[in-house]
Amino acid sequence: MAVTACQGLGFVVSLIGIAGIIAATCMDQWSTQDLYNNPVTAVFNYQGLWRSCVRESSGFTECRGYFTLLGLPAMLQAVRALMIVGIVLGAIGLLVSIFALKCIRIGSMEDSAKANMTLTSGIMFIVSGLCAIAGVSVFANMLVTNFWMSTANMYTGMGGMVQTVQTRYTFGAALFVGWVAGGLTLIGGVMMCIACRGLAPEETNYKAVSYHASGHSVAYKPGGFKASTGFGSNTKNKKIYDGGARTEDEVQSYPSKHDYV
């Protein structure tokens, strides 16, 4: 039960995280005009990964896309790449994790296969979250550097009567959305990896068959026995013979230590 809960929660947390990463990537407010200690202007500037916008006090907002690819700063291109890689990995991870969910039954999929898929999706979520956090952090670092550079420029070259106001940019809402979303995706991935440990069989999966002697009710169990998940009959438990021979799972199921994770 705990394994399913951990897996399900990991999936939901990752889903929210990836939705957040997509939202952050699409948002225009990665950097916003710094209003502190600045003359009050009737124009508010903000920029995203794909376009820059200007909101006028009168109510008009104008956005212009970055229609050049080569003319953009390498750092911005890197941030775009990191966010896109994060989204792609997260989307694939979600797809894989849907089939890995314990509560969803697909044909006669083995527990070991589900465990592998859970682990794969977990790793994908972790990498996706790290990509998003890295992308947002690189952009934030770029902003901090530019902020102090423009602050220095504000106090130079003002010997003349005419002054030019330098627009400084600070952290926009998208950065915080990206950090939180990346963190959630990362947590979701870790949870999936933890759930995977509970799904994986510890030893080689032998079929334990009980032989019913004609006069006795003693069952002979060869080899080691499979760690049960404690969730009723497994989809792969099939009758071997119509007669006295049954798979061990059909006789009784024992709780394993993994049920208490």
Epitope: Q33, P39, V40, T41, A42, V43, N45, Q47, S52, C53, V54, E56, S57, S58, G59, F60, E62, R64, V162, Q163, T164, V165, Q166, T167
Partner: antibody, heavy 117, light 113 residues
Framework: QVQLKESGPVLVAPSQSLSITCTVS????????VQWVRQPPGKGLEWLGA???????NYNSALMSRLSISKDNSKSQVFLKMNSLQTDDTAIYYC???????????WGQGTSVTVAS | DIVMTQSPSSLTVTAGERVTMSCKSS????????????LTWYQQKSGQPPKLLIY???TRESGVPDRFTGSGSGTDFTLTISSVQAEDLAVYYC?????????FGSGTKLEIK
């Protein structure tokens, strides 16, 4: 079509307060800002202040202490209130709609305000 | 506050002539975000409210004749009337629409001989 109409004209005694209502039609106050401008007789234009779509206001720094602009979106009305009027506040008061570039693209006909005892 | 200085204060020209008037601001009105200058030109005829001619320093308002042209950037701006008509008799104002409080120039009075 877009229209703005100021209430008035008004005769005010010195040190009294002034209230003008600008009733708009053809656009919504939740989408566009309204600005106020005055023009003393034979003189140039003076920007008084503005109330923007979100309800935030900006004022002429020289008049800020005695000027107040508010609005009622449902009634499509903008209100200008000015305290402690003096004779040099005698002017034609205009309300105008904010457009592209924060410019005023539509103007009311103006209302004459005379401050005299 | 931003100071807007207009020159000349008055102009007397004959119909068909080319006219230029200047407007200078004490600070740059150029917004780096969209590379637009927040300077507006108005025309006010006697006994009428002002009429918007040009915004963003060079964009003509719809319905304004193309003989009116705005130019300039940063702190120096110009309004040009390529061929003055009798109906252009008015006072022309420039306005800072970038910094609060918005401020007007003192105006340029255009008179026709």
């Amino acid at each position: 079509q877009v229209q703005l109409k100021e209430s008035g004209p008004v005769l005010v005694a010195p040190s009294q307060s002034l209230s003008i209502t600008c009733t708009v039609s053809g656009f919504s106050l939740t989408t566009y800002g309204v600005q106020w401008v005055r023009q003393p007789p034979g003189k140039g234009l003076e920007w008084l202040g503005a109330i923007w779509a979100g309800g935030n206001t900006n004022y002429n720094s020289a008049l800020m202490s005695r000027l107040s602009i508010s609005k009622d979106n449902s009634k499509s009305q903008v209100f200008l209130k000015m305290n402690s009027l003096q004779t040099d506040d005698t002017a034609i008061y205009y309300c105008a709609k904010g457009g592209y570039g924060n410019a005023m693209d539509y103007w009311g006909q103006g209302t004459s305000v005379t401050v005299a005892s | 506050d931003i100071v807007m200085t207009q020159s000349p204060s008055s102009l007397t020209v004959t119909a068909g002539e080319r006219v230029t008037m200047s407007c200078k601001s004490s600070q740059s009105l150029l917004n780096s975000g969209n590379q637009k200058n927040y300077l507006t030109w108005y025309q006010q005829k006697s006994g009428q409210p002002p009429k918007l001619l040009i915004y963003w320093a060079s964009t003509r308002e719809s319905g304004v004749p193309d003989r009116f042209t705005g130019s300039g950037s940063g702190t120096d701006f110009t309004l040009t009337i390529s061929s003055v008509q009798a109906e252009d008799l008015a006072v022309y104002y420039c306005q800072n629409d970038y910094f609060f409080p918005f401020t007007f120039g003192s105006g340029t009075k255009l008179e026709i001989k």
